[in-house]
């Protein structure tokens, strides 16, 4: 009898009630492998969705986000509305991250400026709610005496704009 | 025939993960949808996620942050992870394959959260 | 989440009886709708898909109607096995949600 089953294509199911006929999956439902015993439900996209790749009798439906939103989850099963960069998406809405924190996308959240003392270096560009800062040589390089290039940029603390 | 077996421990208290797992017959679950749902005491249902035949998994958002759905493709069996229950986590749990034209259901397992 | 609205909670009627179930949607379902019946100590099992798709080997006398957000199982006549819970359920969009059942009585 397992081998009866076996024998249905994809696109079909294998009907138990049928004495294990090789059935079409019925509208709206697909099988992607051979021996099914059901068909699986084919998904819809419709609200925030819309549909990448229709449903077919041996494929599901695809879907994606529409504008102003992106996926989240396996096989995009949600949508998250976009926010602009140097927001966060919270329960309220977009917000604009707080000051020391930043995000360069428009989705997830705002993350903390890098320390850049904790490398033992100095601030090199002023961190944005849109940008990390970008972080130089460490002040030991920056000392009289120390060979460099081209003269040092002076060191400011994140978030503070030059006079 | 296909069939779905639930097992797992019928009693776990407070703030413990609740661990179910649901063994599959006549069925591979390398192909279709393999879902988790429960009915709690007053006979409302809840669908809880799913794990498809790609491994990928879906949640209901009412559970993320405490659900999780695995599978063995070795075992043809697939599991539930319920972190921190709580007694309103008391329920009878079923896993199920919905499908077109045939939904298959396992028995259930009441499962009571209580210290 | 999309909220099924079953009703009655729970029905006496009579056998030989014409008894209706309705399921409102919150949102248009596009008929991917399920019925199920449970008997106690079962597990429920599928009575109808895309609304008004009676499944092999369920007596005739179910069947399934409706559209959009507003949807009904009837039992053309009643017979004594069919006493349990109708659960109503839409897989139109996840997560997938169920209404509240309609507990079924014999008069």
């Known amino acids: 009898l397992q081998d009866l089953c076996s024998n249905c294509p994809a696109g079909t199911f294998c009907d138990n009630n049928r004495s294990q006929i090789c059935s079409p999956c019925p509208p709206n439902s697909f099988s992607s492998a051979g021996g099914q015993r059901t068909c699986d439900i084919c998904r819809q996209c419709k609200g925030v969705f819309k549909t990448r790749k229709e449903c077919s009798s041996t494929s599901n439906a695809e879907c994606d986000c529409i504008s102003g939103y992106h996926c989240l989850g396996a096989e995009c099963s949600m949508c998250e509305q976009d926010c602009k960069q140097g927001q966060e998406l919270t329960k309220k809405g977009c917000k604009d991250c707080c000051f020391g924190t930043f995000n360069d996308q428009k989705r997830g959240i705002c993350r903390p400026w890098t320390n850049c003392s904790l490398d033992g270096k100095s601030v090199l560009v002023n961190g944005t709610k849109e940008r990390d800062v970008v972080c130089g040589p460490s002040p030991a390089d920056l000392s009289p005496g120390a060979s460099s290039a081209t003269p040092p940029a002076p060191a400011r603390e994140p978030g503070h704009s030059p006079q | 025939e296909v069939q779905l077996q639930e097992s797992g421990p019928s009693l776990v208290k407070p703030s413990q993960t609740l661990s179910l797992t649901c063994s599959v017959t006549g069925d591979s679950i390398t192909s279709g949808y393999w879902n988790w749902n429960r009915k709690f005491p007053g006979n409302k249902f809840e669908y809880m996620g799913y794990i498809s035949y790609s491994d990928s998994a879906y949640y209901n958002p009412s559970l993320k942050s405490r659900i999780s759905i695995t599978r063995d493709t070795s075992k043809n069996q697939y599991y539930l992870q319920l972190n921190s229950v709580t007694t309103e986590d008391t329920a009878t749990y079923y896993c199920?394959?919905?499908?077109?034209?045939?939904?298959?259901w396992g028995q259930g397992t009441l499962v009571t959260v209580s210290a | 989440d999309i909220k099924m609205t079953q009703s009655p909670s729970s029905m006496y009627a009579s056998l030989g009886e014409r008894v209706t179930i309705t399921c409102k949607a919150s949102?248009?379902?596009?008929?991917?709708l399920y019925w199920f019946q449970q008997k106690p100590g079962k597990s429920p099992e599928t009575l109808i898909y895309?609304?008004?798709r009676l499944v092999d080997g369920v007596p005739s006398r179910f069947s399934g109607s409706g559209s959009g957000q507003d949807y009904s199982l009837t039992i053309s006549s009643l017979e004594y096995e069919d006493m349990g819970i109708y659960y109503c359920?839409?897989?139109?969009?996840?997560?997938?949600?169920f209404g509240g059942g309609t507990k079924l009585e014999i008069k």
């Open positions: 199920t394959r919905w499908g077109i034209p045939f939904a298959f």
């Open positions: 895309h609304a008004n």
């Open positions: 359920l839409q897989y139109d969009e996840f997560p997938y949600t």
């Open positions: 949102q248009d379902i596009d008929s991917y």
